[in-house]
């Protein structure tokens, strides 16, 4: 019985891995989280290209649907506490004096999404965990 329970726990934990990636990617599209910083790699993503845009757009959140996420266990919509995420380490031209500050931000973000687990991903209020090796590894490059 105990073995079955442990197996079931593993299955329950594994069932939401793609949903976890899904929510993280949706958040990434809004907040432009530096997923590239999470992996110490220099390769460019196969299907992600840096955009020709050079403007540094601030991240703002509208009011029509943010703050709402559905929990995996119930049909209850929970508050999704969004802090205005700064896009860390933007490699934009000019203002080189900001490099140290950007490096600090990068370090904070780097811990957001690791293969061994998801912590501090900016999805406050969502207790996310992922022991899978198939975590989001989008190595999209910026300018």
């Amino acid at each position: 019985k105990r073995a079955v329970s442990e197996h079931q726990l593993l299955h329950d934990k594994g069932k939401s891995i793609q949903d976890l990636r899904r929510r993280f990617f949706l958040h990434h599209l809004i907040a432009e989280i530096h997923t590239a910083e999470i992996r110490a790699t220099s390769e460019v993503s196969p299907n992600s290209k840096p955009s020709p845009n050079t403007k540094n757009h601030p991240v703002r959140f509208g009011s029509d649907d943010e703050g709402r996420y559905l929990t995996q266990e119930t049909n209850k919509v929970e508050t999704y506490k969004e802090q205005p995420l700064k896009t860390p380490g933007k490699k934009k031209k000019g203002k080189p004096g900001k490099r140290k500050e950007q490096e600090k931000k990068k370090r904070r973000t780097r811990s957001a999404w690791l293969d061994s687990g998801v912590t501090g991903s900016g999805l406050e209020g969502d207790h996310l965990s992922d022991t899978s090796t198939t975590s989001l590894e989008l190595d999209s490059r910026r300018h």
């Epitope: 993280f24 949706l26 990434h28 599209l29 809004i30 955009s51 266990e73």
Partner: antibody, heavy 118, light 115 residues
Framework: QVQLVESGGGVVQPGRSLRLSCAAS????????MSWVRQAPGKGLEWVAT????????YYPDSVKGRFTISRDNSKNTLYLQMNSLRAEDTAVYYC???????????WGQGTLVTVSS | QLVLTQSPSASASLGASVKLTCTLS???????IEWYQQQPEKGPKYLMD???????STGDGIPDRFSGSSSGAERYLTISSLQSEDEADYIC?????????????FGGGTKLTVL
């Protein structure tokens, strides 16, 4: 209310280029990722491209990679799709779509028809 | 490969209920999907996202006649108290980010006829 209006479609010869536009209103355009999805006549939907809120990240399927470029001008609340080296199989209605925190394609435009024919 | 399979057509009587099925490829049976409605000559409309445990979140202005459920690799869209305007194509879709790529695929769609 959220409104997305596509334009720029038309008849174009194979190998030529075309640029589609999507004018957005009713929401803070610069806060959301945007996408293009197409539908060939009598066929199913196919995802074409996605761009992040500030335009720094773009994503494409293999079918259009290297030929299509998604971009945006947040000051004009406009999304673009630059289509180069067009092929007959690119003939479709092209829809722009807006994400939410919940899903990829929550709001859709009415579409613009692109016909690639000689 | 991420694949969604749908029956090409379905029919049900006005006022009745209908249950449409979207089947995920077996190795992706735990995935969250999305359901869309496309009325004739119109753009698609987002209906809901549907998780493996059957929980779902509906889009803006979607009546509660539309509900979702799950069993294994199958994802269901149930429409109750069918109305004439429910006659449309119903399409499921699924996205994933894996091996540094974002992919999104749609099912072929089910054409629903309201008798």
């Amino acid at each position: 209310q959220v409104q997305l209006v596509e334009s720029g479609g038309g008849v174009v010869q194979p190998g030529r280029s075309l640029r589609l536009s999507c004018a957005a209103s009713g929401f803070t355009f610069s806060s959301y990722g945007m996408s293009w999805v197409r539908q060939a006549p009598g066929k199913g939907l196919e995802w074409v491209a996605t761009i992040s809120s500030g335009g720094s990240y773009t994503y494409y399927p293999d079918s259009v990679k290297g030929r299509f470029t998604i971009s945006r001008d947040n000051s004009k609340n406009t999304l673009y799709l630059q289509m180069n080296s067009l092929r007959a199989e690119d003939t479709a209605v092209y829809y722009c779509a807006r994400q939410t925190t919940m899903t990829y394609f929550a709001y859709w435009g009415q579409g613009t028809l692109v016909t690639v024919s000689s | 490969q991420l694949v969604l399979t749908q029956s090409p057509s379905a029919s049900a009587s006005l006022g009745a209920s209908v249950k449409l099925t979207c089947t995920l490829s077996s190795q992706h049976s735990t995935y969250t999907i999305e359901w869309y409605q496309q009325q004739p000559e119109k753009g698609p409309k987002y209906l809901m996202d549907l998780k493996q445990d059957g929980s779902h979140s509906t889009g803006d202005g979607i009546p509660d006649r539309f509900s979702g459920s799950s069993s294994g690799a199958e994802r269901y869209l149930t429409i109750s108290s069918l109305q004439s305007e429910d006659e449309a194509d119903y399409i499921c879709g699924v996205g994933d980010t894996i091996k540094e790529q974002f992919v999104y695929v749609f099912g072929g769609g089910t054409k629903l006829t309201v008798l």
